[in-house]
Amino acid sequence: APTSSSTKKTQLQLEHLLLDLQMILNGINNYKNPKLTRMLTFKFYMPKKATELKHLQCLEEELKPLEEVLNLAQSKNFHLRPRDLISNINVIVLELKGSETTFMCEYADETATIVEFLNRWITFCQSIISTLT
């Protein structure tokens, strides 16, 4: 059974992941640039199911494409430093989902824009945090 300290650590990591995802979405929403239209043409795979920490495997597999899209946005008005940001998310995701369990991600048939993708994972974090508090 999880201890209160391990639950607290999980909650903190989820809160950090949530903040990182919200920061990306905020940066994109603030982005007044022709590149934004191009960013929205990129398609992301969505998880068929995302209700447990092991499902973060689906997010991990999309981090490289996410970094590539964010690299497009680099400008003096975009302060998110994709490499550092994605690296941070990757570390959190690996710790949260654990490395000892092998989970094959199942994706939904429909792909999504970066905004839909981020909103989906933000909702995921919020729902799990809510069960922990």
């Epitope: 990182d20 919200q22 920061m23 998110l80 430093r81 550092d84 940001l85 690296s87 941070n88 919020q126």
Partner: antibody
Framework: QVQLVQSGAEVKKPGASVKVSCKAS????????MHWVRQAPGQGLEWMGI????????TYAQKFQGRVTMTRDTSTSTVYMELSSLRSEDTAVYYC??????WGQGTLVTVSS | DIQMTQSPSSLSASVGDRVTITCRAS??????LAWYQQKPGKAPKLLIY???TLESGVPSRFSGSGSGTDFTLTISSLQPEDFATYYC?????????FGQGTKVEIK
């Protein structure tokens, strides 16, 4: 005991820039994201942006986009908020807040010609 | 951006009174709501997060309730040190936004 100590009050002329610092002690600096919030005299609270002290990346409220820059120095456990092209409406107390539960004491910035 | 509307903007009450402040969000924020207390010349102090969870060290006379768009902060028995301005804040989506504040004054 977690503590945030901000730099002292500043008086600036319109068009100038101001850089406010916020030094953290009592916890792992890189562990908590830092928000900046301001409060104009007699007014409510307004979120300006957030920085991840670990990665150094930040995002800002649309209203301040292009005028605000948040940075950090991990060697001194300090985050900075720089606001440029100051106008009289920027006269306010500027707060840093770590994880929303710990706040700095505030820094009064007065913009006056 | 999500708009947060508090009511009333000010109220007068006596020590021992039960005080209720309401906060309404322009769209559902689930339970992602916090309440702060601020005294003149001081930084805001977190009282309640996640709608109803009391921050460590906050007296039990403070309580929060609600979900979705409508939230309430209740002070069961007002104490002299409770006269201050109270703010609600949503952290459901960026940018985080605050209510305009409710000033609790001595009657």
């Amino acid at each position: 005991q977690v503590q945030l100590v901000q730099s002292g009050a500043e008086v600036k002329k319109p068009g100038a820039s101001v850089k406010v610092s916020c030094k953290a002690s009592g916890h792992t600096f890189t562990r908590y994201y830092m928000h900046w919030v301001r409060q104009a005299p007699g007014q409510g609270l307004e979120w300006m942006g957030i920085i991840n002290p670990s990665g150094g990346y930040a995002t800002y409220a649309q209203k301040f986009q292009g005028r605000v820059t948040m940075t950090r120095d991990t060697s001194t456990s300090t985050v900075y908020m720089e606001l440029s092209s100051l106008r009289s409406e920027d006269t306010a107390v500027y707060y840093c807040a770590s994880g929303w539960d710990v706040w700095g004491q505030g820094t009064l910035v007065t913009v006056s010609s | 951006d999500i708009q947060m509307t508090q009511s009333p903007s000010s109220l007068s009450a006596s020590v021992g009174d039960r005080v209720t402040i309401t906060c309404r969000a322009s769209q559902s924020i689930n339970s992602w709501l916090a309440w702060y207390q601020q005294k003149p010349g001081k930084a805001p102090k977190l009282l309640i997060y996640a709608t109803s969870t009391l921050e460590s060290g906050v007296p039990s006379r403070f309580s929060g309730s609600g979900s979705g768009t409508d939230f309430t902060l209740t002070i069961s028995s007002l104490q002299p040190e409770d006269f201050a301005t109270y703010y609600c804040q949503q952290s459901y989506s960026f940018p985080p936004t605050f209510g305009q504040g409710t000033k609790v004054e001595i009657k």
